[in-house]
């Protein structure tokens, strides 16, 4: 059975300023390939946080993602501000030349309230 | 820059234990999984044991598993091997590794030397 | 296991290529190099074909299904070693090595 993408929540609501946590679960490691975190769609969505590689201010993996069998992939987004607001999508890639986008989760949408 | 340093390699008698650190430098150690990769004389490499960042999850080889374990302490910046019923077998040169993401290595470390001897 | 011919030779300024099967498609690869026995291995390609940035760009990695293959192009006098492609399964949890290919620059 292919592999599932879970988003839990299709919405949080955060204050600007806190840290809101976007879940995301998969039902499988295979078929092997990296995770990535996207805010928005199609051609101009923005690379949040790649489990890949390290350096992404402000957003940090939840679980220890360094487990050989670990399955979750929830982030953390620390001091976020207005323009965080959008919807996130945890996205599962199949390895390659280059790697193939194979399932995406159903995503979770941002608000951020003022202070 | 990322540094590894292996420490403990030792002429141990067979039977007996030994424990293996690795002191690392120029990264967030915590934040990585770590290995031993071992190498006996004239062979190829083999992989010994691996921790994830937080020490949580240990994995080991079929051939040191249940007389092994591997630790670390991150407030140290140490990786530990504790080898115990040691066979000549377990000579070999003893690695530290950092792992990528997908559990591959990125660096090593100098190595340190043990040697069974009776 | 990983299998990988145990000896390759080549010219200096030749092309040569390094194959390793065996891992299955659950599997990741990379491949490290040792100048000599006992000494520290170094990485020239992780993740099938990520180079770290300190390793020179004619070495480059390529995986299509179970087989990886390092390829080194130009090869240099420097470039005499023993080659090991290593695997990580995702199925087992457990990495592997293959025995190590003997670069021999003629």
């Known amino acids: 059975t292919e592999v599932k993408v879970i988003q839990p929540e299709k919405s949080v609501s955060v204050a600007a300023g806190d840290s809101t946590v976007l879940n995301c679960t998969l039902t499988s490691l295979l078929p092997v390939g990296p995770i990535r975190w996207y805010r928005g769609v199609g051609q101009s969505r923005q690379l949040i946080y790649s489990f890949t590689t390290e350096h992404f201010p402000r957003v940090t993996n939840v679980s220890d993602a360094t487990k050989r069998s670990n399955l979750d992939f929830s982030i953390r987004i620390s001091n976020v501000t207005p323009e965080d607001a959008g919807t996130y999508y945890c996205v599962k890639f199949q390895r390659g030349s280059p790697d193939t986008e194979i399932q995406s989760g159903g995503g979770t949408e941002v608000y951020v309230l003022a202070k | 820059d990322v540094q590894l340093v292996e420490s403990g390699g030792a002429v141990v008698r067979p039977g007996e234990t030994l424990r293996l650190s690795c002191t690392a430098s120029g990264f967030t150690f915590s934040s990585y999984a770590m290995s031993w990769v071992r190498q006996a004389p004239g062979k190829g490499l083999e992989w010994v044991s691996g921790i994830s960042a937080s020490g949580s999850d240990t994995y080991y080889a079929d051939s040191v598993k249940g007389r092994s374990t591997i630790s670390r302490d991150n407030s140290k910046n140490t990786l530990y091997l504790r080898m115990s019923s040691l066979t000549a077998e377990d000579t070999a040169v003893y690695y530290c590794?950092?792992?990528?993401?997908?559990?591959?290595?990125?660096?090593w470390g100098l190595g340190t030397l043990v040697t069974l001897s009776s | 296991a990983l299998t990988q011919p145990a000896s390759v030779s080549a010219n200096p300024g030749e092309t040569v290529k390094i194959t390793c099967s065996g891992g299955?498609?659950?599997?990741?690869y990379g491949w490290y190099q040792q100048k000599s026995p006992g000494s520290a291995p170094v990485t020239l390609i992780?993740?099938?074909?990520k180079r770290p940035s300190d390793i020179p760009s004619r070495f480059s990695g390529s995986a299509s299904g179970s087989t990886a293959t390092l390829t080194i192009t130009g090869v240099q006098a420097e470039d005499e070693a023993v080659y090991y492609c290593?695997?990580?399964?995702?199925?087992?949890?457990?990495?592997?090595f293959g025995a190590g290919t003997t670069l021999t620059v003629l």
């Open positions: 992780h993740s099938d074909d």
């Open positions: 590794a950092r792992e990528t993401w997908n559990h591959l290595f990125d660096y």
């Open positions: 290593g695997g990580y399964d995702y199925t087992t949890y457990v990495n592997t």
């Open positions: 299955g498609t659950s599997s990741y």
